[in-house]
């Protein structure tokens, strides 16, 4: 009742390992680290064998099957590259993610590499199977902005690509009788989000109620340069229309806004966000050169067929941009308390301009950013967002513009996208 | 085309409670606050409160405050107002107007008497 | 809280005739930051409900006869009715929405 030797397969052994095999004797089949137990097409750990009553064994030895990952998962924004030859992805072979640079970047920077386990399973060192992060870039033009040493206080065309967090926000608010037709700017912060003024994306009643539009009456257009050639911008509707549950109409204090995109948009040399500062009640320094972008509205009356189509001459087509400084808060608060009316600049404001006048934000829309470089991270950082002026034309002499100081709603602004600040440390400026 | 339809008249004894309605009709209901409006017989009108349907926000005036309850039924597109305590000073022509007073209903009379 | 206060309380004119009445409130109801005035004036006529004719001092409601007109800045306002028709009889009020809203006393036109 002797059953015949038995040969291990090739990467695995058998145990236990007997010179002969007698009736009811029994075998186990295993293999090599890497390898799993193939048997009728079937991957398993082991495989239990039987001498039986004849002299025969229950089975066939079964083969052992190197272990397979198979093809990785992809990964948004960014690419795969194989390391092994002939793109294995069999045990031990190593892949490595990498982002979509230079509009994304990897999460805590990690490395990428995945190795393919004995489990069948692409591993990361640091984050085990879960696939890392590829998050947008923040506040790098791929078009170099100009020195700002230069004083320029006229607008200049910017180039495509120069201010690639500017959007173009509409709203048409056809609840409102007759229905309402305006217009503003924003900020991409991510390519879900965009930050602008409430004032922008507040229901222009006839009373002072602060009620937002309605989600389906804004539209929002990046990458936007020419307003007579929207064919290469990016258009989107809003998932969501959030603005501060203090928002003041009367004062225009905490004057800030988010519009959550329908679709995330894809980002590109065209269409990048910028960065947020750091929670700072101090804001941007006095003196310090920003600049703000828009289309230079002329006329608030302007129509949205008269903004989208060409030929107008509400606001400019290109979009321009003009550098401004930081003025001395007490400066600023001064200037405006000389005046007749409500002029109130709180701490949650800036103001920016130039003594002698000349050009200011009516170069920008309401809600633009102001972008201040920030030469720690390298990075351009929204400090500020269009918000008010003085009763005169703009330009004048000692009418400041006034912003909204965005460095005091960062927390604000982090809850409202449902991202904890820790996991979008590189958007935030370092 | 846009309606607001009020609630029939109402004869109620003093210190009873009155509940008149003001049904919306022909644009988005949650676009838009209800405001409420008093009108005793030949006086001037009174402005009592609002309430915004989207998220049931309401502002009163400070006269109205114990007076009246705003609510909304967004699956009815129906505003609500309730008057407690009623005394003959309640007694008057009572208005629902929506999309910032462009439409008004055609009011409910509310006769407060023993 | 803002008091509105309407003058005169009633008046009469011949049809045809130019009409002015006017509000006045207790404190500015011009917003610096959007520019507008929260001034408007309605019309009652006897048995109806209010209708508004003209918004944010004087911008004039759609459908509204262009002989209303809304004028005044701050706390000075004015309502011109400047050829009256007969189906002008009615009283005309005026409301703040600057802060919550107020309605004045109204204007009772009579016509002779």
């Known amino acids: 009742n002797e059953c015949p030797e038995l040969q291990p397969p090739v990467h695995g052994k058998i145990e236990p390992s007997q010179a002969k095999y007698f009736f009811k004797d029994q075998v186990l089949v295993s293999c090599d680290t890497g390898y799993k137990v193939l048997k009728d097409n079937v991957e398993m750990d082991t495989f239990q064998i039987e001498c039986l009553k004849d002299g025969t064994w229950s089975n066939k030895i079964p083969t052992c099957k190197i272990v397979d990952c198979r093809a990785p998962g992809e990964l948004e924004h960014g690419l795969i590259t194989f390391s092994t030859r002939n793109n294995l992805t069999t045990y031990k072979s190593e892949i490595k993610y990498s982002c979509q640079e230079p509009y994304y970047k990897m999460l805590n920077n990690n490395t990428g590499i995945y190795t393919c386990s004995a489990q069948g399973v692409w591993m990361n060192k640091v984050l085990g199977r879960s696939l890392p992060t590829c998050l947008p870039e923040c506040g790098q033009p791929s078009r170099s902005l100009p020195s700002l040493v230069k004083r320029i206080i006229g607008g200049r065309n910017a180039e495509p690509g120069l201010f690639p967090w500017q959007a173009l926000i509409v709203v048409e608010d056809t609840s409102r009788v007759p229905n309402d037709k305006w217009f503003g700017s924003g900020a991409l912060l991510s390519a879900s989000w965009i930050l602008t003024a409430a004032h922008v994306l507040r229901s222009q009643r006839r009373d002072t109620t602060v009620i937002p539009v309605s989600k389906e009456h804004v539209t929002v257009y990046l990458g936007l340069h020419d307003v007579r050639d929207k064919s290469g911008a990016v258009n989107s509707s809003a998932a969501r229309v959030v603005l501060h549950p203090d928002f003041n109409i009367q004062n225009y204090n905490h004057d800030i806004a988010l519009v959550q995109l329908q679709e995330p948009v894809p980002l590109g040399p065209h269409v990048m966000p910028v960065c947020l500062p750091r929670l700072e009640p101090e804001g941007p320094a006095p003196h310090m050169l920003g600049l703000v972008a828009g289309w230079g509205i002329s006329n608030p009356n302007v129509t949205v067929d008269e903004i989208i189509s060409s030929g107008t001459r509400t606001l400019s087509d290109v979009l321009q941009y003009v550098k401004l400084p930081v003025v001395p808060h007490a400066e600023c608060k001064t200037s405006y308390e000389s005046r007749s009316g409500n002029y109130s600049v709180t701490e949650n404001m800036f103001c920016a301009g130039y003594y002698e006048g000349g050009k200011d934000t009516c170069l920008g829309d309401s809600g633009g950013a102001f972008v201040i470089f920030d030469d720690l991270s390298q990075r351009w950082v929204v400090q500020g967002l269009v918000s008010w002026g003085g009763p005169e034309e703009c330009g004048s002499k000692q009418v400041y513009g006034v912003y909204t100081k965005v460095s005091n709603y960062v927390d604000w602004v982090w809850e409202q996208m449902g991202l904890p600040q820790s996991v979008v440390e590189p958007q935030v400026e370092r | 085309q846009v309606q607001l339809k009020q609630s029939g008249p109402e004869l109620v004894k003093p210190g009873a409670s009155v509940k008149l309605s003001c049904k919306a009709s022909g644009y988005t209901f949650t676009t838009d606050d209800i405001n409420w409006v008093k009108q005793r017989p030949g006086q001037g009108l009174e402005w009592i409160g609002w309430?915004?349907?989207?998220?049931?926000?309401?502002k009163y005036n400070d006269k109205f405050k114990d007076k009246a309850t705003l609510t909304v039924d967004t699956s009815s597109n129906t505003a609500y107002m309730d008057l407690h305590s009623l005394t003959s000073e309640d007694s008057a022509v009572y208005f629902c107007s929506s999309l910032e007073d462009t439409y008004w209903g055609q009011g409910t009379l509310v006769a407060v008497s023993s | 809280d803002i008091v509105m206060t309407q003058s005169p309380s009633s008046l009469a004119v011949s049809a045809g005739e130019k009409v002015t009445m006017t509000c006045k409130s207790s404190?500015?109801?011009?917003?610096?930051?959007?520019?507008?005035?929260?001034l408007a004036w309605y019309q009652q006529k006897p048995g109806q409900s209010p209708k508004l004719l003209i918004y944010w001092a004087s911008t004039r409601e759609s459908g509204v006869p262009d002989r209303f007109t809304g004028s005044g800045s701050g706390t000075d306002f004015s309502l011109t009715i400047s050829s009256v028709q007969a189906e002008d009889l009615a009283v005309y009020y005026c409301k703040q929405s600057y802060n919550l809203y107020t309605f004045g006393g109204g204007t009772k036109l009579e016509i002779k």
């Open positions: 404190q500015s109801l011009l917003n610096s930051r959007t520019r507008k005035n929260y």
């Open positions: 309430i915004y349907p989207r998220d049931d926000r309401t």
